[in-house]
């Protein structure tokens, strides 16, 4: 279940896909992949306040508890719902080769 | 890829499974479930340091980032990597139904 | 606006050189692979290979691994597939085709070059 | 012999709805995406469906992407005299990197 998509913290502040822009070296991967040399990551970011953008019945369970026990259950977290796939050219042994990642960029997100 | 799963932090302290009790009224269903009258929720909890249980390449794309840049890309989230399902005994308009929910108890965790 | 611009139609013989070019406008020239993709008359699309402009980077799919070379000189903008010593089974059309910003699809194409190789 | 599999030729009456498949295995559509081109006669692909479902900004909603399990379907409601092309499907290949399908050519009856 999708629930309510209206951020009630203002526009912006909840759970929702952003883009940072990041070098091969702000990766780590300087040393093993080759391109892009630069990639726009997509990732979840903001808070999940009551129902917003509930992934499902744990999600649901988990506000309600945190709304009783903070210190105990943390409130739902920003994740990544789907991701978008990307190719990399990368260094091997022999040369270069071109390999497909299906879990590298958020494409859209939800809070669990 | 489940990458290290020593934490850091000392024991306990990482993302892991947690069993948080909780009665119908806490998790709000006091109106519509019959049975059972309390529930044993396992939740992820805890923090996830670098590389700690890393769900799959976002997950360390988002260390990498939290790193370079903590105040703009949150640390990966501890949540579930699986769901134990579960039956509910609830009310009906013509009596009482079972229903069984496969997202509402976590079976195991990672970070992401 | 983003376009892909290549040379035009080509007619020639077995063991002749050629080639050919795609040259684009619009964006970052260097921020986006380019491939190529063979078309032979009347038949189906064939993924040939694929540039990294900026670092000049190539990989070739393993049925045309040997047959040509691509390449591309970014300070014109322009990719290139060429042939050292043509075969009437090189007869085609080929397309240049921009990558999308994942790597995974052609976004942008270009209008395609016709290549004939006859005696 | 393409790595994946459409049919050669499907045909429909203008205004009514029209799939075409792809079917694929475990090393491609199985485990990663699938994209669509349409190719009008005498024309350049272009880019229709990409990452199975999304489509890009100019493109019909009356065309639309799925996929299931190792095959993937590109479907046309309210079809149009305009429609009649050629569609291949795209994906990628652990063995061959980016493979087309053999294409499949839409006739408007």
């Known amino acids: 279940a999708r629930n309510g998509d209206h951020c009630p913290l203002g526009p912006g502040r909840c759970c929702r896909l952003h883009t940072v822009r990041a070098s091969l070296e702000d990766l780590g991967w300087a040393d093993w992949v080759l391109s892009p040399r630069e990639v726009q990551v997509t990732m979840c970011i903001g808070a999940c306040p009551s129902q917003f953008r509930a992934a499902n019945m744990h999600a649901q369970i988990k506000t309600s508890l945190h709304r009783l026990k903070p210190d105990t259950v943390p409130a739902p977290c920003c994740v990544p719902a789907s991701y978008n796939p990307m190719v990399l050219i990368q260094k091997t042994d022999t040369g270069v080769s071109l390999q497909t990642y299906d879990d590298l960029l958020a494409k859209d997100c939800h809070c669990i | 890829a489940r990458n290290g799963d020593h934490c850091p932090l000392g024991p306990g302290r990482c993302c892991r499974l947690h069993t948080v009790r909780a009665s119908l009224e806490d998790l709000g269903w006091a109106d519509w479930v019959l049975s059972p009258r309390e529930v044993q929720v396992t939740m992820c909890i805890g923090a996830c340091p670098s590389q700690f249980r890393a769900a799959n390449m976002h997950a360390q794309i988002k260390t990498s980032l939290h790193r370079l840049k903590p105040d703009t890309v949150p640390a990966p989230c501890c949540v579930p990597a699986s769901y134990n399902p579960m039956v509910l005994i609830q009310k009906t308009d013509t009596g009482v139904s079972l229903q069984t929910y496969d997202d509402l108890l976590a079976k195991d965790c990672h970070c992401i | 606006e983003v376009q892909l611009v290549q040379s035009g139609a080509e007619v020639k013989k077995p063991g002749e050189s050629l080639k050919i070019s795609c040259k684009g406008s619009g964006y970052s020239f260097t921020s986006y692979w380019i491939g190529w993709v063979r078309q032979m008359p009347g038949k189906g699309l064939e993924w040939m290979g694929v540039?990294?402009?900026?670092?000049?980077?190539?990989i070739y799919s393993p049925s045309f691994q040997g047959q040509v070379t691509i390449s591309a000189d970014k300070s014109i903008s322009t990719a290139y597939l060429q042939w050292s010593s043509l075969k009437a089974s090189d007869t085609a059309m080929y397309y240049c085709?921009?990558?999308?910003?994942?790597?995974?699809?052609?976004?942008?194409w270009g209008q395609g070059t016709l290549v004939t190789v006859s005696s | 012999q393409s790595v994946l599999t459409q049919p050669p030729s499907v045909s429909g009456a203008p205004g009514q709805r029209v799939t075409i498949s792809c079917s694929g295995s475990?090393?491609?559509?199985?485990?990663?995406?699938v994209n669509w081109y349409q190719q009008l006669p005498g024309t350049a692909p272009k880019l229709l469906i990409y990452s199975n479902d999304n489509r890009p900004s100019g493109v019909p909603d009356r065309f639309s992407g799925s996929k299931s399990g190792t095959s993937a379907s590109l479907a046309i409601t309210g079809l149009q005299a305009e429609d009649e092309a050629d569609y291949y499907c795209?994906?990628?290949?652990?063995?061959?990197?980016?493979?087309f399908g053999g294409g499949t050519k839409l006739t408007v009856l």
């Open positions: 475990s090393s491609n559509i199985g485990v990663l995406y």
């Open positions: 540039i990294d402009p900026d670092g000049s980077y190539t």
């Open positions: 085709a921009r990558y999308g910003r994942y790597g995974t699809y052609f976004d942008y």
């Open positions: 795209q994906s990628w290949d652990s063995s061959s990197n980016y493979v």
